[in-house]
Every structure is written in structure tokens, then in C-alpha cells.
């Protein structure tokens, strides 16, 4: 089995607890991989306001993950 490592995670720190739904353009979920040992939820903000990492343990992140998984499977 490949070793999981933290070094190449996309997010730094725990992430924000919530983002205003009205500000969300897109949500992307990165599952644990060889590059990063944790799930990451990346929010793309509207109006070119960049991206934010959402704390994967937050209520909002759990809802987003559930929604995406329902859509994909």
C-alpha cells in the first residue's frame, strides 16, 4: 500500500466552517489519495473571488459531501 502523506494537500489549516451559499459557484471534493491523507472540500466563489477550503468536519461540508455522493452514485 502506498504511504499516505500530508505534504501535498491542497488546503492549509483546518478550513473555514461555512461559506454563504449565495457566494458558492462550485464545490469540489478531493478524496484521500497518495498525495494527501484527508478529504478536502474546495469552494470556488462567485465573481472571481477565488477559492476557499471548507473544514471537512463542518456541518456544511458534510452536507455538500453527501449531496455530491448522492449525485455521483
Amino acid at each position: 500500500f502506498p504511504m499516505f502523506k500530508r505534504g501535498r494537500c491542497l488546503c492549509i489549516g483546518p478550513g473555514v466552517k461555512a461559506v454563504k451559499v449565495a457566494d458558492i459557484e462550485k464545490a469540489s471534493i478531493m478524496y484521500p489519495s497518495n498525495n494527501c491523507d484527508k478529504i478536502e472540500v474546495i469552494i470556488t466563489l462567485k465573481e472571481n473571488k477565488g477559492q476557499r477550503c471548507l473544514n471537512p468536519k463542518s456541518k456544511q461540508a458534510r452536507l455538500i459531501i453527501k449531496k455530491v455522493e448522492r449525485k455521483n452514485f
Epitope: L10, C11, G13, G15, R52
Partner: nanobody, 126 residues
Framework: EVQLVESGGGLVQAGGSLRLSCAAS????????IGWFRQAPGKEREGVSL????????YYADSVKGRFTISSDNAKNTVYLQMNSLKPEDTAVYYC???????????????????WGQGTQVTVSS
Amino acid sequence: EVQLVESGGGLVQAGGSLRLSCAASGFSFDDYVIGWFRQAPGKEREGVSLISSSDGSTYYADSVKGRFTISSDNAKNTVYLQMNSLKPEDTAVYYCAAGNGLLRLWMFHVSAYDYWGQGTQVTVSS
């Protein structure tokens, strides 16, 4: 009220050392990434180093790698920047900043940070 207060700047000769401190208050320290930036006269503010208090991960700009060390004391809500082998080109006002939800891609983007200190002057003479 959120506050970031830098201290430890001063005048030092080339090759010398300084330790900067950034004392944070008014927010949950563990939720934030603390970054050090600097701005030399007539230049843009640039990222120097950052630390995530939650897991201790650290990042450095190439220009300071091997010379500067960032650390944090979570009990004191304080981040330190130990600067060794200082060069005249390190002369600048040094600022600490707090950001949340940062991506590596944007880690030294000024706009990614929510709170800023007032800065402390570092002057390195040759």
C-alpha cells in the same frame, strides 16, 4: 476585536539575527493560518513564511528558505519568525496576517488573508 501585534524588529548588521513575534487575539487561533509578509520601499508586499497552528505545517518563500524559521506557541497565541543570516535585501516592514480556508496555490496572496497587523520595521545594514 481581532488584533495582530508584531514586535521584535530593529536595526541589525548583515549576517545577524532577529526574532519577530506576532501576538494574536480576538479569534480562534487554531482555526487560522498565520503568515509573515514583508514590504520594502517601492515594492509590493510579498509572502515570507506561514504556519498552520492546527497541525504545525510550515511554508517558506524560496528567498528565505534555510535562513528563516517560523514557529508558534499555541498557549500564548503567538507566532515567531526567527531570522538568521540576514541580508540587506531583507530590509522591509514585516507584517503578520491571519487567514482561514487557504489553498496552497494562494498561500502568499495578500487577498487571501482576513486580518493584518500594523507591521514592524527590520533594517539590515551592510
